[in-house]
Amino acid sequence: SHTLPVRLLRPSDDVQKIVEELQSLSKMLLKDVEEEKGVLVSQNYTLPCLSPDAQPPNNIHSPAIRAYLKTIRQLDNKSVIDEIIEHLDKLIFQDAPETNISVPTDTHECKRFILTISQQFSECMDLALKSLTSGAQQATT
């Protein structure tokens, strides 16, 4: 498995800007993916989101999320996906083994995978932003 280069920790306001952008991009991706009719969300896929044993902004499972988005990129060529991956790269602060995700082989199952992960990713970015803003409020009190 590959390891990512060590990056300097970003100030939390930088992280918040990145997550705000990711939240917006995730909504765009989901909107387009949802236009494919007759595809249902699957219970078989779970996107890791926030780590309960870490404090914001280090609680976002960026390496795992990035791995899932890179898997979607093998199936879908929307440029918004490239942009999401670029932003997720900025949130990876230390060496992390790259998660291997197996791509579904059946076409319909691929569509379900994309829809499910896109939906979970959108919800995850909402949660990440909430955790960052609540963390910032706690820091100021």
């Epitope: 765009m28 909107k31 993916v33 236009e35 494919e36 093998q74 879908d76 060529n77 929307k78 440029s79």
Partner: antibody
């Protein structure tokens, strides 16, 4: 029956401008595909010009040589994509095709759809 | 970004096995299509996603490859297969791009 119909070709003088249209019929613009312009000079190969994404954002990708002189745009209400061509030269003489491509696994080969092409001749 | 197709032309007989290759200057992650074109007509899709046969295309056409190297094979050339063949990458995201191979003209030996 899904179709793409190009129009707007014809004879134009060097330095002139032309706007080509690509009208979709039998389907309406929705997410998960790209519409592109491709050209073919007489007796030559296919040459990609530009693509525009049909979805939440009108992302565009231009061939490096096309940037500046060629501009793609779309009108969702008219189900039409346009190619504005400026400062035309003799070497721009070609049949111009518009084509629809999949943005992935969506509808698979149904997304690969080509028009019949429109001839643009640049000559004085 | 470049797609190099070879050979640029080939002569073959009916019944021959024909192989055309397409090499990308960087990995295109199987975002590759193959077309057949006859004079005065738009290209006709044969293969998409490197190896998937388009609907209505005879099974004598097949595609293979991954990463940077791809192949179109016609297992037994038929009279209607004499035409020009193109490979194309159709990746929308910025890390690959779009483009066509230079073409391979298949003529009667």
């Amino acid at each position: 029956q899904s179709q793409l119909v190009e129009s707007g070709g014809g004879l134009v003088q060097p330095g002139g401008s032309l706007r080509l249209s690509c009208a979709a019929s039998g389907f309406s613009f929705s997410a998960n595909y790209w519409i592109c312009w491709v050209r073919q000079a007489p007796g030559k190969g296919l040459e990609w010009i530009v693509c525009i994404y049909i979805g939440s954002r009108a992302d565009t990708y231009y061939a490096p040589w096309a940037k500046g002189r060629f501009t793609i745009s779309k009108d969702n209400s008219k189900n039409t994509v346009y190619l504005q061509m400026n400062s035309l030269r003799a070497e721009d003489t070609a049949v111009y095709f518009c084509a629809r491509f999949s943005s992935g696994i969506y509808d698979l080969d149904r997304f690969f759809l080509w028009g019949q092409g429109t001839l643009v001749t640049v000559s004085s | 970004f470049q797609l190099t197709q070879s050979p640029s032309s080939l002569s073959a007989s009916v019944g021959d096995r024909v192989t055309i290759t397409c090499q990308a200057s960087q990995s295109i992650e199987s975002w590759l299509a193959w077309y057949q074109q006859k004079p005065g007509k738009p290209p006709k899709l044969l293969i998409y996603q490197a190896s998937k046969l388009a609907s209505g295309v005879p099974s004598r056409f097949s595609g293979s490859g991954s990463g940077t190297d791809y192949t179109l094979t016609i297992s037994s050339l038929q009279p209607e297969d004499f035409a020009t063949y193109y490979c194309q990458t159709y990746y929308g995201g910025g890390h690959i791009g779009w483009g066509f191979g230079t073409g391979t003209k298949v003529t009667v030996l």
